[in-house]
Structure formats: structure tokens, C-alpha cells
């Protein structure tokens, strides 16, 4: 059974992940972003179901494509290099989903834009956090 300290750690990691995803969304989904139109042409796979931490496997598998799209953005728009940012997210995702069980991600039929993709995972984090508090 999860202890209060492990629940608190999970909550903090989810909050960190949430802020990272929101920061990326803020950097992209902005009328001042010269590459927004181009970025919106890239398609991302969405999870068929995302209600548990193990479903973060679906996010992990899309981190490489996410990094590639972020590389399009002008460097002056990004405080952190995309590689560093995605690396930070990857570390948190691995810790949250755990590595002891292998989970095969199931994707929805419809693909999504980067904005829809980020919003979906932001909602996921908020939902899990709300169950922990």
C-alpha cells in the first residue's frame, strides 16, 4: 500500500510534470510564435485511455516526436533547450510510471495537434493530482 510520503512524492512529481507541460504549451500556443502554424501540422498519437500512472507510457513514447517539433521553435523563445526539457520530463515520467511492469500503450484512432496533445496530458496530470489531494 502506498505510504503518505510516497503519495506526497508522487504528487510533487506530477506537479513538476504538469508545470513543464504547461510551460511548453505556453511557449508554443502563442500568437507571437512564428512557427505555430508549422508546428500545428505535426500529428501526435493520443492515448485511448489515460487514467492511471502506467498510462504515462503513452506520453513517454511521444517524447521524441515532441522534441523534434520543439526544435523548430526559435532558440530565443525557449529558456531551456528542447533536449534538456524533454530529458527532464522523461526522468519524471519514468519515475512515475515505474519500470517494473511493462505496459503496452493503446492509442486512439484520431491523431492530434501538439496543442491538443499537451492539453490532454495536462488534464491527465490535473486529474491524478486531484485524486491524491
Amino acid at each position: 500500500a502506498p505510504t503518505s510520503s510516497s503519495t506526497k512524492k508522487t504528487q510533487l512529481q506530477l506537479e513538476h510534470l504538469l508545470l513543464d507541460l504547461q510551460m511548453i504549451l505556453n511557449g508554443i500556443n502563442n500568437y507571437k510564435n512564428p512557427k505555430l502554424t508549422r508546428m500545428l501540422t505535426f500529428k501526435f498519437y493520443m492515448p485511448k485511455k489515460a487514467t492511471e500512472l502506467k498510462h504515462l507510457q503513452c506520453l513517454e513514447e511521444e517524447l521524441k516526436p515532441l522534441e523534434e517539433v520543439l526544435n523548430l521553435a526559435q532558440s530565443k523563445n525557449f529558456h531551456l533547450r528542447p533536449r534538456d526539457l524533454i530529458s527532464n520530463i522523461n526522468v519524471i515520467v519514468l519515475e512515475l510510471k515505474g519500470s517494473e511492469t511493462t505496459f503496452m500503450c493503446e492509442y486512439a484512432d484520431e491523431t492530434a495537434t501538439i496543442v491538443e496533445f499537451l492539453n490532454r496530458w495536462i488534464t491527465f496530470c490535473q486529474s491524478i493530482i486531484s485524486t491524491l489531494t
Epitope: 508545470l19 504547461q22 510551460m23 505556453n26 500556443n29 502563442n30 530565443k76 523563445n77 529558456h79 495536462i122
Partner: antibody, heavy 120, light 111 residues
């Protein structure tokens, strides 16, 4: 001094069209992004559309996408909003506002507004 | 879209007394470069809006120093240290971190 003057408002029937203009003076118009913001009678502010300084990018609020078109003529220092398929809910005072994308302050100067009334 | 929620919606204040307006965003407004694009606008009766504060706490040119802004992340506050008669109107918070959205507005009136 910076001046923005809107015109083109009036009473129009639902489904009809209207074109608003915003004449700019007192600054280098071609260096600034421009927005349209509207305010329904007795209500709050709603962002409508933005156009880049060079006209290269245009974005709209969902409720006007496919009906409204923002454009600009930098040689005439004028911003436009072409409004088609007008609805009762488009009734509002329409303001143009300036935005220096590369500075820290957005929406730093506003026009006095022009009233659009959509009614049968 | 980012939703901006202001409280209170109406604020009756005595002349010379302080006033405070809160604004909360539905998600963090911190950008990837560390900046936070949260502004405050004033709209006097019958007038267009006017920029007061940008990037949380910076006063725009010509704005009296009795106006100040503070906050971080998702919670922001506009304070007027001593309300004057000319401060009557509606105050809006606005975020431009993503596509612009405004709070519902807070009406400042004199008691």
C-alpha cells in the same frame, strides 16, 4: 502621439456583412502587431483577432473563425476587420489595439471603438 | 483556452482607502523563458481600456505609483494604495502568455 481611430460600425441585419477600419498614426504602423477586441453592451472584453506586423500570421477566436477576416495595409497605416455572416451575438463595440511583439507590454494603446449592432 | 477569474466582481471603496483585486488563471502563466505575461487594464466609464500594469508588476508609462501588481504562477493581485475619484471604473486582468483572454472585470466604485 499614438492614435487609433476605428470606423465602419453601424446597424446591420443578421447574415449580412460589414467592414471595420482602424486608422493608425503617431507611430511606425508596420512595426506593430494589431488586435481587434470587442465588448458586448454592459459586458466584459473579448479578444477577436490578431495580425502580425507584416501580415504574415493571423489568428482568431473560435467563435469568429471562418466568418471574420483581419487584414492590414501598411502603406495606408490601416487595419481592417471584414465581418461576414453576422449574428446577434456579434453586437459589440469593436476596439483595435496595438501590440509590440518584441517588447514586454501588449495592448498598450487602444482606439475609442466603433459600435456594431446586428439586429433584424 | 486559459480562463481568468477575478474577485470580487464589485468593490465599493472609500476615497483615500486601499483597494485590492484578485485574478486567478486556470493554468500557470509561466512561459518557457521564465516570463509571465499577465497585465491589468483600467476602463473608465465611456472610455476604451487602458494598460496599467504589464508582466505582473511593471507600471506602464504615465500610470500613478499608487497602482501596483504582484503574484506568480496562477494567482495575481492589483492593489491601489489610496483610491482617488478618477480610479472609478472596471479593472480587467489579461493574459497574453497564450492567446489573449480577459477576466470578467471588477467594478470599482466609491462608497
Amino acid at each position: 502621439q499614438v492614435q487609433l481611430v476605428e470606423s465602419g460600425g453601424g446597424v446591420v441585419q443578421p447574415g449580412r456583412s460589414l467592414r471595420l477600419s482602424c486608422a493608425a498614426s503617431g507611430f511606425t504602423f508596420s512595426s506593430f502587431g494589431m488586435h481587434w477586441v470587442r465588448q458586448a453592451p454592459g459586458k466584459g472584453l473579448e479578444w477577436v483577432a490578431v495580425i502580425w506586423f507584416d501580415g504574415s500570421n493571423k489568428y482568431y477566436v473560435d467563435s469568429v473563425k471562418g466568418r471574420f477576416t483581419i487584414s492590414r495595409d501598411n502603406s495606408k497605416n490601416t487595419l481592417y476587420l471584414q465581418m461576414n455572416s453576422l449574428r446577434a451575438e456579434d453586437t459589440a463595440v469593436y476596439y483595435c489595439a496595438r501590440d509590440d511583439f518584441w517588447s514586454d507590454y501588449p495592448f498598450d494603446y487602444w482606439g475609442q471603438g466603433t459600435l456594431v449592432t446586428v439586429s433584424s | 483556452d486559459i480562463v481568468m477569474t477575478q474577485t470580487p466582481l464589485s468593490s465599493p471603496v472609500t476615497l483615500g482607502q486601499p483597494a485590492s483585486i484578485s485574478c486567478r488563471s486556470s493554468q500557470s502563466l509561466v512561459n518557457i523563458d521564465g516570463s509571465t505575461h499577465l497585465s491589468w487594464l483600467q476602463q473608465r466609464p465611456g472610455q476604451p481600456p487602458r494598460l496599467l500594469i504589464y508582466k505582473i508588476s511593471n507600471r506602464f508609462s504615465g500610470v500613478p505609483d499608487r497602482f501596483s501588481g504582484s503574484g506568480a504562477g496562477t494567482d495575481f493581485t492589483l492593489k491601489i494604495s489610496r483610491v482617488e475619484a478618477e480610479d472609478v471604473g472596471v479593472y480587467y486582468c489579461m493574459q497574453t502568455t497564450q492567446f489573449p483572454t480577459f477576466g470578467q472585470g471588477t467594478r470599482l466604485e466609491i462608497k
